[in-house]
Interface confidence: low
């Protein structure tokens, strides 16, 4: 215990990752609007931290829409330097175990686990689905193995960054390696559940792209978005098959998507999520 305390003397100075976007609209889900045009635009994908192309209908929508890839990167992606360096760290608790729980700024509302340095145990907390920090685990076991009873060296491929507490420069910040999967599936499986505007309480299912599972939600009966299925089976059929291991090579699955008041267009997404 004394060694552990000595090793982490600057724990209270740890700053959270440089991850909150400069503009709140960068966290908005892509919205192509209700109109019928077919205009190429770019949006910032909060899940992948990358600017991606989408087809804009020509009216309404939201501020997460840019005419060029460069403009999108300038406004939203510059806070996310991409690093893919292979990293290792030695036996003992990684620094991020001592960060406070951080729900992030999104509204995905997911039960996750974090290491509570006060109680010295892993506990549940509510995660919004994006951003936050690395003290965030899908399972209690993963949290315990990483922060309560860490074993020997971990080796990870990770693109996340952390502020160096000594000179405030960006450094690579490792995390215990989850299994990384690529989601190659229809774009309507990505947005968070949207209750809509009416008063009903119908049980529907939405695909939670952060955890890779279909979860129930209460639908108001009107409005909302296309991530809305009448049965768990329908949700799984539409979205779950989009999961393939990142190591498997192959083309993206292109899914035809029919949109109201608009010609059929082909959209696909590629994002990386954790899967247990």
């Amino acid at each position: 215990a004394a060694e552990e305390d000595e090793e982490f003397t600057n724990i209270t100075d740890i700053k959270p990752p440089l991850q909150k976007p400069t503009h709140s609209f960068c966290a908005m889900k892509v919205d192509d609007g209700p109109c019928r045009a077919y205009i190429k635009r770019f949006f910032f994908n909060i899940l992948t931290h990358q600017c991606e192309e989408f087809i804009y209908g020509g009216c309404e929508g939201n501020e997460n829409r840019f005419e060029s890839l460069e403009e999108c990167k300038e406004k939203c992606a510059r806070d996310y330097p991409k690093m893919t360096t292979k990293l290792t760290f030695q036996k003992g608790k990684p620094d991020f175990c001592f960060l406070e729980e951080d729900p992030g700024i999104c509204r995905g509302y997911i039960t996750r686990y974090f290491y509570n340095n006060q109680s010295k145990q892993c506990e549940r907390f509510k995660y919004g689905g994006c951003l936050g920090n690395l003290n965030n685990f899908e399972s209690l076991e993963e949290c315990k193995n990483t922060c309560e009873n860490p074993t020997s060296d971990f080796q990870v491929d990770d693109h996340r960054t952390q502020l160096n507490t000594v000179n405030n420069t960006l450094i690579n910040q490792p995390t215990k390696a989850p299994r990384r999967w690529a989601f190659h599936g229809p774009s309507w499986c990505l947005p968070p559940a949207d209750r809509g505007l009416c008063q009903a309480n119908e049980i529907r299912f939405f695909y939670n792209a952060i955890i890779g599972k279909c979860r129930p939600f209460k639908y108001s009966g009107c409005g909302g978005n296309e991530n809305n299925f009448t049965s768990k089976k329908a949700c799984i059929t539409a979205c779950k098959k989009g999961f393939i291991p990142k190591s498997i090579k192959g083309g993206l699955i292109k899914t035809k998507r029919k949109k109201k008041k608009q010609p059929v267009k082909i959209t696909y997404v590629e994002t990386f999520v954790k899967k247990t």
Epitope: R107, L140, A193
Partner: antibody
Framework: EVQLQQSGTVLARPGASVKMSCKAS????????IHWVKQRPGQGLEWIGA????????TYSQKFKDKAKLTAVTSASTAFMELNSLTNDDSAVYYC???????????????WGQGTTLTVSS | DIVLTQSPASLAVSLGQRATISCRAS??????????MHWYQQKPGQPPKLLIY???KLESGVPARFSGSGSETDFTLNIHPVEEEDAATYFC?????????FGGGTKLEIK
């Protein structure tokens, strides 16, 4: 119909251990967390901990982490709570409850067992 | 731990009148616009029964005379008009973080 059926009244000696059960029916047992709550006579409700029957992940209140052990047997759709080193303070009604999760509405207890009464006496 | 303080500890309300029960949390129980505060009713010899979830949403089958409101740290349960069968103890409960905690309870008596 969703039901949580708990085992009957238990009388135990100080220092002993007891194991109570909570049998779920009417829904997919592995989909929802099962929580355990303590209520002493004429008093409030205290959260003990919860278990995810799907993978046996368990989480405990700091106060009960050395007192209670939560387990689940999916083939029997039954959750168990074992209480050890019993004292008079453990005399209470213990409830199991199902945690439900719906989108943004939060998670809460929508169904409860009828309770198991534990009396610790020498 | 998040401490939930309920007030009053007990109250007596005439039939047909309004009962108001307050629950104050020691820190915010709201996240991303969801208020993780829930209300239960408990009658002697019975387990608690869910009335209101997410601060203001009425559980299926619960009469519309029950309503909930509030956000962050201050929440209220209203019963109007009060009926005989509403005599019970009412608990608030938060689920924002472990350990989940309950208020001390409010005993409602019908005059």
């Amino acid at each position: 119909e969703v039901q949580l059926q708990q085992s009957g009244t238990v009388l135990a000696r100080p220092g002993a251990s007891v194991k109570m059960s909570c049998k779920a029916s009417g829904y997919s047992f592995t989909t929802y967390w099962i929580h355990w709550v303590k209520q002493r006579p004429g008093q409030g409700l205290e959260w003990i901990g919860a278990i995810d029957p799907g993978n046996s992940d368990a989480t405990y209140s700091q106060k009960f982490k050395d007192k209670a052990k939560l387990t689940a047997v999916t083939s029997a759709s039954t959750a168990f709570m074992e209480l050890n080193s019993l004292t008079n303070d453990d005399s209470a009604v213990y409830y199991c409850s199902r945690e439900v999760y719906y989108g943004y509405d939060g998670d809460y207890f929508d169904y409860w067992g009828q309770g198991t009464t534990l009396t610790v006496s020498s | 731990d998040i401490v939930l303080t309920q007030s009053p500890a007990s109250l007596a309300v005439s039939l047909g009148q309004r009962a108001t029960i307050s629950c104050r949390a020691s820190e915010s129980v709201s996240v991303h616009g969801t208020h993780l505060m829930h209300w239960y009713q408990q009658k002697p010899g019975q387990p608690p029964k869910l009335l209101i979830y997410a601060a203001s949403k009425l559980e299926s089958g619960v009469p519309a005379r029950f309503s909930g409101s509030g956000s962050e740290t201050d929440f209220t349960l209203n019963i109007h008009p009060v009926e005989e069968e509403d005599a019970a103890t009412y608990f608030c409960q938060q689920s924002i973080g472990d350990p989940w905690t309950f208020g001390g309870g409010t005993k409602l008596e019908i005059k």
